[in-house]
């Protein structure tokens, strides 16, 4: 079938990086500068994407593949193929319609993008809070209060003045 198709359609012999030039008796011509064809048998080459302004070039365009963009410093990619750039925030913040806002108490964000997420509820797993959460970091859950009862071996014994497993507010 491939052989008969190529006999019927000379364009099917044109490899990626070329196009089937109707103006030149259907011979395979190289893609012009700033254009590409990623598959064989193309009758035209596609214009290369230009990474300008908020976009930076991550990968240059070649005759067989489009350019790939990422975002200028202070922004990160959104959407398929980095179709938009979104402003970074600091860790401990999230981006709202009015800009970067600190995470509310009880939530954290350890990245420059995305939303603030609630701290882990250690008690749901029968554990206690070993390290308190912050705007930038989740809580660290430790052994369950039962594991810290007298006689049980623990790396750091609880302070005698406080009930084990409870963290200061």
């Amino acid at each position: 079938f491939e052989r008969t198709r190529s006999l019927q359609d000379p364009c099917s012999n044109c490899p990626a990086g070329t196009f089937c030039d109707n103006n030149r008796n259907q011979i395979c011509s190289p893609c012009p500068p700033n254009s590409f064809s990623s598959a064989g048998g193309q009758r035209t080459c596609d214009i290369c994407r230009q990474c300008k302004g908020v976009f930076r070039t991550r990968k240059e365009c070649s005759s067989t593949s489009n350019a790939e963009c990422d975002c200028t410093p202070g922004f990160h990619c959104l959407g398929a193929g980095c179709s938009m750039c979104e402003q970074d925030c600091k860790q401990g913040q999230e981006l709202t319609k009015k800009g970067c806002k600190d995470c509310c108490f009880g939530t954290f964000n350890d990245q420059k993008r995305g939303i603030c997420r609630p701290w882990t509820n250690c008690s749901l797993d029968g554990k206690s809070v070993l390290v308190n959460g912050t705007k930038e970091r989740d809580v660290v859950c430790g052994p369950s209060p039962a594991d810290l009862s007298p006689g049980a071996s623990s790396v750091t014994p609880p302070a005698p003045a406080r009930e084990p497993g409870h963290s200061p507010q």
């Epitope: 302004g53 908020v54 976009f55 959104l78 938009m84 750039c85 979104e86 402003q87 981006l95 800009g99």
Partner: nanobody
Framework: QVQLQESGGGWVQPGGSLRLSCAAS????????MSWARQAPGERFEWISS????????SYLPSVKGRFTISRDNAKNTMFLQMDNLTPEDTAVYFC??????????SGPGTQVTVSS
């Protein structure tokens, strides 16, 4: 395919004025907030101004407020930036962008603005 084409840049003396234009195609221009941004040599890409879809609400970078005016003509799919009382610090490549100051895309080559005596 979204296309944005900036024009109107040039050389001007301090205190002078320029009017930039942005011709948009390939999307429903009247439905989008549009923005202007700029990048000076060796500096970070910087948002300058945004205008909502109807043109009734504008916002500005504090350092350009009172000197720059953003506007749009939805019938002609065009956005403008009137720049008055220009200073050497305004020297940069100016880009028009689809979207807000926090989330945007650019596709044009930009237009160079040079302010010097």
């Amino acid at each position: 395919q979204v296309q944005l084409q900036e024009s109107g840049g040039g050389w001007v003396q301090p205190g002078g004025s320029l009017r930039l234009s942005c011709a948009a195609s390939g999307f429903a221009f009247r439905d989008f907030t549009m923005s202007w941004a700029r990048q000076a040599p060796g500096e970070r890409f910087e948002w300058i101004s945004s205008i909502n879809p109807s043109g009734g609400s504008q916002s500005y970078l504090p350092s350009v407020k009172g000197r720059f005016t953003i506007s749009r003509d939805n019938a002609k799919n065009t956005m403008f930036l009137q720049m008055d009382n220009l200073t050497p610090e305004d020297t940069a490549v100016y880009f028009c962008a689809r979207g807000t100051r926090y989330k945007m895309s650019t596709s044009g080559p930009g237009t160079q603005v040079t302010v010097s005596s």
